[in-house]
Interface confidence: low
């Protein structure tokens, strides 16, 4: 069947369209094209006769049409009026007529649209704005974009006039956005430039910053006002109702109490004609004086004197605060505050109470601190210490002893040998000593301020022969798997080698054994019962050697899990039950028994004569070592059968 296809169907003005013929019969007389849906001579465009190969224009020919041998018609430079139906009249060679109709639509190439507005400066919550997409174009579809997004769903947005008009009712500042319209038809789509909606709003209630309303005399007052507004607000400041200046910021240097009052910021929007005000009340406080501390005793004596520290000056209705060592006051029965907190009393001062102490006066804005005060606590002297700790020296060496005692003011020192005063120095030096220098060396420390003296006596032995050493221990009764023990070989002597033996053997290699302090100290970590052996230390130098008496380590251990004997668990009625309990323990444990959970007796042996089946049950032995603080127990079930009922039963003891 003869058909016409329009390529394209939708044609842009100025372009061309091909009316393409399908299924054209083979043998033709000719054909003719007409404008419209029927053959009408008045509307003939062109005719073509095969035989003459002659194309004849008709009344509707415009000069823009070209006819092809296959009967297709090309129309160039399309105009709007070309829209519509076209009919091909084919005369076959047998002069049979055939018609086919095709059509196309012509659309203008759309111009770039623009947006017109009925209100260029709408006022928030008051005005509506109608955007219209220009120009008005037939057969065009209108679309709208807000910030390059399609229109949001909103009851305040309304499309009308075939979507050509977008109305925003009761505009808000949030409607300030980029608006674009787009026109579309089947042959083109064009977007307008964006139009920014300038919504006038505000001023909102202004905010005054900073928020603080309390100031100190002498500070600068710098207030800034801001109100959301379009166009930006014009600002004015009033102080106590008096107009000050028309600026966004109000600056008053070096304020005084007289600057206290109500500060009003007025924001004005010249376009909306609206004014809004915010009031803040500023309070200026007089600067309090810097506090200082007075003391009733500048040189208190430790453990004797009390000290009262007072925060000056005295100001009515003021909160006083105290700090010791930059921290708030610790809770202590020796620290007392007066009712108004202005006086801090230290009862029975100690050397640790030196401070520093600070007091503070709290006002509405801040806390003013005093300068720190340090107490000069007089103390000591404590018992002096003499160093080095050696008590044994070889002849010919130099003896240099130093004495020190904690004291404030620093102690004055004196040395005595065998009760005879030697010199008033902190150090005592004797060169090239002999056996005659052996004796009692006393250091006396004196505190001139407190009048107190303390002494320490040290026995010095000068001998070529080493003395017999002895072993001191830091723990005479260590607990197994818990304690460590440190043995120290005494005395400490110069140029001396220290040696150790365990059960007459040199020290075994063990990670639990450690020598230190020039081998003078032997430490046993995590002692075990196997460490309960004889320990001997020895000292030797190039002249002599000597060994200590043995010290046996008493390791506390246990109680281990007890054993109940005999092991029998079945007895004949009438036999005697004689159970003995034993547990390895040092010291020996305390024993107790329970039968079927009921306490019996605190003995190692449990004896029951002539048992019966009533004596059936669980027999528990409990062991307790008071020294180690450990407990242990074991349970044994005993069955008593009637006489002669069961062979192999024990007759008992």
């Amino acid at each position: 069947k003869l058909t016409i296809e329009s390529t394209p169907f939708n044609v842009a003005e100025g372009k061309e369209v091909l009316l393409l013929v399908h299924n054209l019969p083979q043998h033709l007389f000719g054909y003719s094209w007409y404008k419209g849906e029927r053959v009408d001579g008045n509307r003939q465009i062109i005719g073509y006769v095969i035989g003459t190969q002659q194309a004849t224009p008709g009344p509707a020919y415009s000069g823009r049409e070209i006819i092809y041998p296959n009967a297709s018609l090309l129309i160039q430079n399309i105009i709007q009026n070309d829209t519509g139906f076209y009919t091909l009249h084919v005369i076959k060679s047998d002069l049979v007529n055939e018609e086919a109709t095709g059509q196309f639509r012509v659309y203008p190439e759309l111009p770039k649209p623009s947006i017109s507005s009925n209100n260029s400066k709408p006022v928030e919550d008051k005005d509506a704005v109608a955007f219209t997409c220009e120009p008005e174009t037939q057969d065009a579809t209108y679309l709208w974009w807000v910030n390059n997004q399609s229109l949001p769903v909103s009851p305040r947005l309304q499309l009308s006039n075939g979507n050509r008009t977008l109305t925003l009712f009761n505009v808000t500042r949030n409607d300030t956005a980029s608006y674009k319209c787009e026109t579309q038809n089947p042959v083109s789509a064009r977007r307008s430039d964006s139009v920014i909606l300038n919504v006038l709003y505000g001023p909102d209630a202004p905010t005054i910053s900073p928020l603080n309303t309390s100031y100190r005399s002498g500070e600068n007052l710098n207030l800034s006002c801001h109100a959301a507004s379009n166009p930006p607000a014009q600002y004015s400041w009033f102080v106590n109702g008096t107009f000050q200046q028309s600026t966004q910021e109000l600056f008053i240097p070096n304020i005084t109490v007289n600057n206290s009052g109500s500060y009003t910021c007025q924001a004005h929007n010249s376009d909306t004609g609206l004014n809004r005000t915010t009031v803040t009340t500023i309070t200026v406080y007089a600067e309090p004086p810097k506090p200082f501390i007075t003391s009733n005793n500048s040189n208190p004596v430790e453990d004797e004197d009390a000290v009262a520290l007072t925060c000056e000056p005295e100001i009515q209705n003021t909160t006083y605060l105290w700090w010791v060592n930059n921290q708030s006051l610790p809770v202590s029965p020796r620290l007392q505050l007066s009712n108004d907190n202005r006086t801090l009393t230290l009862l029975s001062v100690t050397r640790n109470d030196v401070g520093p102490y600070e007091c503070g006066i709290q006002n509405e804005l801040s806390v003013d601190h005093s300068d720190p005060v340090i107490l000069n606590v007089l103390y000591g002297p404590d018992d002096p210490t003499i160093s080095p700790s050696y008590t044994y020296y070889r002849p010919g060496v130099n003896l240099s002893l130093s004495c020190h005692a904690a004291s404030n003011p620093p102690a004055q020192y004196s040395w005595l040998i065998d009760g005879n005063i030697q010199q008033h120095t902190q150090e005592l030096f004797i060169s090239n000593i002999t056996e005659k220098n052996s004796g009692l060396y006393t250091c006396q420390a004196n505190n001139s301020a407190s009048g107190h003296s303390r002494t320490t006596v040290k026995t010095i032995t000068v001998s070529a022969e080493l003395p017999k050493p002895s072993i001191s221990s830091n723990n005479s009764k260590p607990v197994e798997d818990k304690d460590a023990v440190a043995f120290t070989c005494e005395p400490e002597a110069q140029n001396t080698t220290y040696l150790w033996w365990v059960n007459g053997q040199s020290l075994p290699v063990s990670p639990r054994l450690q020598l230190s302090n020039g081998n003078r100290t032997l430490t046993l970590f995590n002692v075990t019962r196997n460490d309960a052996r004889a320990y001997v230390c020895g000292i030797q130098n190039s002249v002599s050697a000597n060994r200590s008496d043995p010290v046996t380590l008493d390791v506390l251990y246990g109680p281990d899990t007890p054993i109940i004997s005999p092991p029998d668990s079945s007895y004949l009625s009438g036999a005697n039950l004689n159970l003995s309990c034993h547990s390895a323990s040092n010291p020996s444990p305390q024993y107790s028994w329970r039968i079927n959970g009921i306490p019996q007796q605190h003995t190692q042996v449990l004896f029951i004569a002539k048992i019966t089946p009533n004596n059936n049950g669980t027999y528990a032995c409990f062991v307790s070592n008071l020294a180690t603080g450990r407990n242990n127990s074991i349970v044994k079930s005993i069955t008593v059968s009637a006489s002669g009922t069961s062979p192999g039963l024990s007759a008992g003891a």
Partner: antibody, heavy 121, light 106 residues
Amino acid sequence: EVQLLESGGGLVQPGGSLRLSCAASGFTFSSSYMGWVRQAPGKGLEWVSSIGSGSYSTSYADSVKGRFTISRDNSKNTLYLQMNSLRAEDTAVYYCARYPSVPFPPPLDYWGQGTLVTVSS
Amino acid sequence: DIQMTQSPSSLSASVGDRVTITCRASQSISSYLNWYQQKPGKAPKLLIYAASSLQSGVPSRFSGSGSGTDFTLTISSLQPEDFATYYCQQAGNPHTFGQGTKLEIK
């Protein structure tokens, strides 16, 4: 019709005092800001002082601060300027003027005819 | 304080001339500027407020413009009654005036 009528000017010795008055009519005086502006002979205008609708809000030019006091009596529709410790440089015509409530901030929209103050020994 | 400087200090012109007087503030005053006219022996009269708004009853030949620091008073066609001294005034605090511009007949 707005009218402002100043009085109280005259000749005064340096260090002396004078009190100017301004009688207002034709508008709601009690709700209007008022001010004084002076003009020395052959010179330009100089703002002197202003007062709010309530007497609590006052402001002064630095040149008169501490010597002049502006006040008002709303019941009498009258504005005053108490001038103490007068100096030769205070010699001027003193105008009373009104600040309207709008526009914002307000200009001086109505002025009196002025009163001459002469400070001379 | 904000200083206001007018220029010129004096100006000679003829009836029908277009005249411009400028006023410069020492710092930005937004649009808070007023213009006044004063004739000898008379009180000043408000012409323009808020830099560009014409006071009621003032002929439309007077116009004002500017914002920030630079402002202008323009008389589009001088009339005989316009010869006077013109003052600008900033409406901040204190309310300082310019030194004045005397407009005389040429």
